[in-house]
């Protein structure tokens, strides 16, 4: 015999009250022991028989012959409640005296001991012919983790004995295990949406629900997939889950339509150079699609051009940009467009940049060198270099004089404003070689250096001179 | 595949009563409706009603309501449509057509279309 | 009832060529129109649903487009067995109604 009822009673002592198995003499109080407890049963006392509706043993021994069966009683089989109700059911077993060893009833689930703090009491009844033990189990506000099967074991004389199982079914609201998930899709273009609910109770059916309106007229078993034939604008779908316990509704999720993004915004110069232009930008909201790649349209601003646009095409981050190859001292107008799958961003406002001045890109022209012994310095003039307006203001020029005779390698410049076309360089070493170059600077940079000219320095008092304009490469004039 | 197969033609005198079946394979049956639509000869297309064969639901056209009767036999996966009362007006081709429970969705397969004469 | 108007009881066109059959219907209906093609003797074929969404096996050639009240079935390069009758339909709102049909012919 079993007993399995709804309860409300948290006290230890309140919660068994039901109708006990067995025959039990009304003179023994009972005796009880926590679940997880092992204690032996109290000494035996007198054979009894044996109750007629017993379970069946598991496990037979050798001894088991010479001893009358024991088993645990029929209990519920099959215990139906609701959600968060409590629950309360019982393993009953009567050991006749005959039986020396036992040891305690233990709780198992699935196949799992159930160990710890579980609700659970055993409690004893001896009289003349043995002894009835009671296991209770009691769940308090049971969830669906709850579910499954419940059942005693118990060892006598050696041998397991194992109950009937009582099966507890929770029931409740349906409970997603798979919700619609939010996407981004193509307009016009079909889709998936996945939803899955269980109860117990089942079935579980499914309605789907676009911006609040049912999309199926009928219910769908669980698990339901819709198929949206195509979107023109962005929607919200649901799912709507029943059972026999009532309905759960999913969350909501967006669908939105993939458009073309929308233009960058915040272009700034974060540097400029003669020859390019350092950019950046924001980008737009991304239409709902990943941006792909950017592209930076640059137009001469102030030119009486045909308007052509360069185009620079750069992956969509970092959301910057080396315009290179540019013209020195001009100014452009710059502006940024981005890609998704679906297409091209409007462009970006155009904004105003200007490169920097250049450096010269011509060598200044006719470069003597003379040798002046009395005074021991060399005596250097050029002709200022042709310096277009881009190559900037001219600042000045630099002159590398590099000394070599045996065993010595002098390398020097020299820095002189642009006032004039000469300078006067002190002779570093004698019975050597000078190579002299010149470069012309601007506030852009330093140009390039013109071709070598070479004079030789003789020894004190001996004196060669060597007068140049600009040779040819690797032409070395001497006297 | 999805196919509908209709019963074949039939002759009736004026007055008289008709049943034409619509037998259904290669899908759900019970999960989708079944609509019938008449077609006159050189004439449009009229919708007369569907029928849900997992609960029996239907729904008709007003214009049919007391001409036509739709039924459905989920066992054999047949739908009927009965026609009583036949005059020369009833004259037409009667399809069968498939519909999902799914508001996107509208007739994707249809039988193949069974000419009914009303002739004394 | 909603009335689903098909302006032309018949279109001209050539093989190759791309034409176009309108619809309208008396009140909004969404995007719940379909169009069907319909063969001398053989029951309707569904072409396009939802508007735009074309029916399994549909060649590429057929288009649908519109939304509310007026719809539009296109059929870029023609092909001689496209030269027959097509139907719009509403599943908006019940009873279902059909339009009369366009016949597509040879010019």
């Known amino acids: 015999g079993g007993t399995a009822e709804k309860w409300e009673e948290t006290e230890l002592d309140q919660l068994f009250s039901g109708p006990l198995p067995g025959r039990l003499p009304v003179n023994h109080r009972p005796f009880s022991a926590p679940h997880s407890s092992r204690d032996q049963l109290p000494p035996p006392q007198t054979g009894r028989s044996h109750p007629a509706h017993t379970a069946a043993p598991q496990v037979t021994s050798t001894a088991s012959k010479l001893l009358p069966p024991v088993a645990f009683n029929h209990t519920i089989g099959h215990i139906v409640l609701s959600e968060h109700k409590n629950v309360k059911f019982n393993c009953s077993i009567n050991i006749p005296n005959t039986y020396q060893e036992t040891a305690g009833i233990s709780w198992w689930k699935d196949g799992k001991e159930l160990l710890g703090a579980h609700h659970s009491i055993t409690q004893f009844y001896p009289d003349e012919e043995g002894v009835s033990i009671i296991a209770l189990f009691s769940i308090a506000s049971v969830q669906r983790s709850d579910n499954g099967s419940y059942f005693c074991k118990m060892k006598v004389n050696n041998r397991e004995i194992v109950s009937d199982p009582i099966y507890v079914e929770v029931q409740g609201l349906p409970y997603f295990i798979k919700q619609p998930e939010s996407v981004n899709v193509t307009r016009n273009t079909a889709f998936n949406l996945t939803c899955q609910a269980v109860g117990p109770p089942e079935p579980v059916n499914i309605f789907w629900v676009q911006n609040s309106s049912r999309v199926n007229e009928k219910p769908e078993r669980s698990p339901s997939v819709l198929t949206v034939p195509g979107l023109t604008e962005t929607a919200v779908f649901s799912c709507e889950a029943h059972n026999d316990k009532g309905l759960t509704v999913s969350k909501g999720v967006h669908i939105n339509i993939k458009v073309i993004p929308s233009p960058p915004t915040e272009v700034h110069i974060l540097n400029s150079t003669a020859h390019s232009i350092l950019v950046s930008w924001v980008p737009g909201f991304d239409g709902y699609s990943p941006l792909q790649n950017c592209s930076i349209q640059v137009k001469e601003a102030d030119r009486l051009s045909n308007g052509s646009v360069m185009v620079f095409n750069t992956s969509a981050s970092p959301h910057l940009y080396e315009i290179q190859q540019l013209q020195a001292l001009a100014n452009y107008s710059i502006a940024v467009s981005c890609r998704n799958e679906i297409g091209w961003s409007a462009v970006s406002p155009w904004i105003l940049a200007s490169t920097t001045e250049g450096a010269p890109s011509v060598a200044p022209l006719n470069i003597t060198v003379f040798l002046n012994e009395s005074n021991n310095i060399l005596d250097i003039r050029w002709t200022k270099p042709p310096i277009k307006r881009q190559d900037g203001e001219l600042v000045g020029y630099r002159i590398s004089h590099v000394w070599e005779s045996a065993g010595t390698y002098k390398e020097l410049s020299e820095e002189v404003s642009q006032n004039g076309s000469w300078a006067q360089i002190p002779v570093q070493i004698h019975n050597a070689t000078c190579t002299v170059r010149i470069a012309a600077i601007t506030k852009g940079g330093i140009g390039p250096f013109s071709e070598p000219v070479n004079i030789i320095i003789p020894e004190h008092s001996k004196v060669d001179y060597a007068p140049s304009s600009t040779p040819a490469p690797g032409n070395t004039d001497s006297m | 595949q999805v196919q509908l197969q209709q019963s074949g033609p039939e002759l009736v005198k004026p007055g008289a009563s008709v049943k034409i079946s619509c037998k259904a394979s290669g899908y759900a049956f019970s999960s989708s409706w079944v609509n019938w639509v008449k077609q006159r000869p050189g004439k449009g297309l009229e919708w007369i009603g569907r029928i849900y064969p997992g609960d029996g639901d239907s729904n008709y056209n007003g214009n049919f309501k007391g001409k036509a009767t739709l039924t459905a036999d989920k066992s054999s996966n047949t739908a009927y449509l009965q026609l009583s009362s036949l005059t020369s007006e009833d004259s037409a081709v009667y399809f069968c057509?498939?519909?999902?429970?799914?508001?996107?969705?509208?007739?994707?397969?249809w039988g193949q279309g069974t000419p009914v004469t009303v002739s004394s | 009832d909603i009335v689903m108007t098909q302006s032309h009881k018949f279109k001209s066109t050539s093989v190759g060529d791309r034409v176009s059959i309108a619809c309208k219907a008396s009140q909004d209906v969404g995007t719940s129109v379909a169009w069907y093609q319909q063969k001398p003797g053989k029951s309707p074929k569904l072409l396009i649903y939802w508007a735009s969404s074309r029916h399994t096996g549909v060649p590429d050639r057929f288009t649908g487009s519109g939304s509310g009240t007026d719809f539009t079935l296109t059929i870029s390069n023609v092909q001689s067995e496209d030269l027959t009758d097509y139907f719009c339909q509403q599943y908006s709102t019940y009873p279902y109604t059909f339009g009369g049909g366009t016949k597509l012919e040879i010019k």
């Open positions: 057509a498939r519909k999902s429970h799914f508001i996107y969705y509208t007739l994707d397969y």
